[in-house]
């Protein structure tokens, strides 16, 4: 014997209080498939939130993220706050990357400079919190006669310590 | 169902006080991170204060420092915002928030807030 409620179709639910008719989901609430004895509630998009797309009778509301912070995990499950460039989030809130590491984007880690001379080369470019260093030719590399300009060393700055 | 509803918000002259409230249902809130964030008008939102899950760790923005306190009453799955000798840019919606699964370990991601009350501060 087929089940009655396998003819309900997406956006209703099998009603078994009326004979098990295919009834509308009532309103703020979804089901994305067909045969469902339930409708789904509503995703809600508020607060840190916000909608991206609306909910209908057949599909979940999607969220992202208020303007300030951004999405973490599968769907947006979370928003997670934005730094400037130049600095990590801590449990204490935004703080300027250490001397010697950099981060270049409103999240993420501050990460280490690169080691020029681990690949036998010279810092052309000194780091900053925002920027890594950029590595230039080995000296090896350069032309008989050729001006090789050593850069200063970079003036420490006032890094935070470790969190 | 898992809910945060704010309350407390108005309007307060500069240098005046506010106490806002929220209200948890529907999971312990002493399994978690809690924040306030706040949104000014026509502004991004910003991060305002966070406690752990027992109240020993709590933390501010710059420009709150001094002047507001986050504490919270997990007998009563509630927490709460004191704010104190408040100025004008101190006006916006503020939020509670729930610090998501793993917050502090793995990432500081917000998963379920409120609706938000409003704060006015005016002469």
């Known amino acids: 014997l087929q089940d009655p409620c396998s003819n309900c179709p997406a956006g209703t639910f099998c009603d078994n209080n009326r004979n098990q008719i295919c009834s509308p989901c009532p309103p703020n609430s979804f089901s994305s498939a067909g045969g469902q004895r339930t409708c789904d509630i509503c995703r809600q998009c508020k607060g840190v939130f916000r909608t991206r797309k609306e909910c209908s009778s057949t599909s979940n509301a999607e969220c992202d993220c208020t303007p300030g912070f951004h999405c973490l995990g599968a769907g947006c499950s979370m928003c997670e706050q934005d730094c400037k460039q130049g600095q990590e989030l801590t449990k204490k809130g935004c703080k300027d990357c250490c001397f010697g590491t950099f981060n270049d984007q409103k999240r993420g880690i501050c990460r280490p400079w690169t080691n020029c001379s681990l690949d036998g080369k010279s810092v052309l470019v000194n780091g900053t919190k925002e920027r890594d260093v950029v590595c230039g030719p080995s000296p090896a590399d350069l032309s008989p006669g050729a001006s090789s300009v050593t850069p200063p060393a970079p003036a420490r700055e006032p890094g935070h310590s470790p969190q | 169902q898992v809910q945060l509803v704010e309350s407390g918000g108005g309007l307060v002259k500069p240098g005046g006080s506010l106490r806002l409230s929220c209200a948890a249902t529907g999971f312990t809130l002493s399994n978690y991170w809690m924040n306030w964030v706040r949104q000014a008008p026509g502004k991004g939102l910003e991060w305002?204060?966070?406690?752990?899950?027992?109240?020993?760790?709590?933390y501010y923005v710059d420009s709150v420092k001094g002047r507001f306190t986050i504490s919270r009453d997990n007998a009563k799955n509630s927490l709460y915002l004191q704010m104190s000798s408040l100025r004008a840019e101190d006006t916006a919606v503020y939020f509670c928030a729930r610090g998501g699964e793993g917050y502090g370990v793995d990432h500081y991601g917000l998963d379920v807030s409120g609706q938000g009350t409003t704060v006015t501060v005016s002469s």
């Open positions: 305002v204060a966070n406690i752990n899950q027992d109240g020993s760790e709590r």
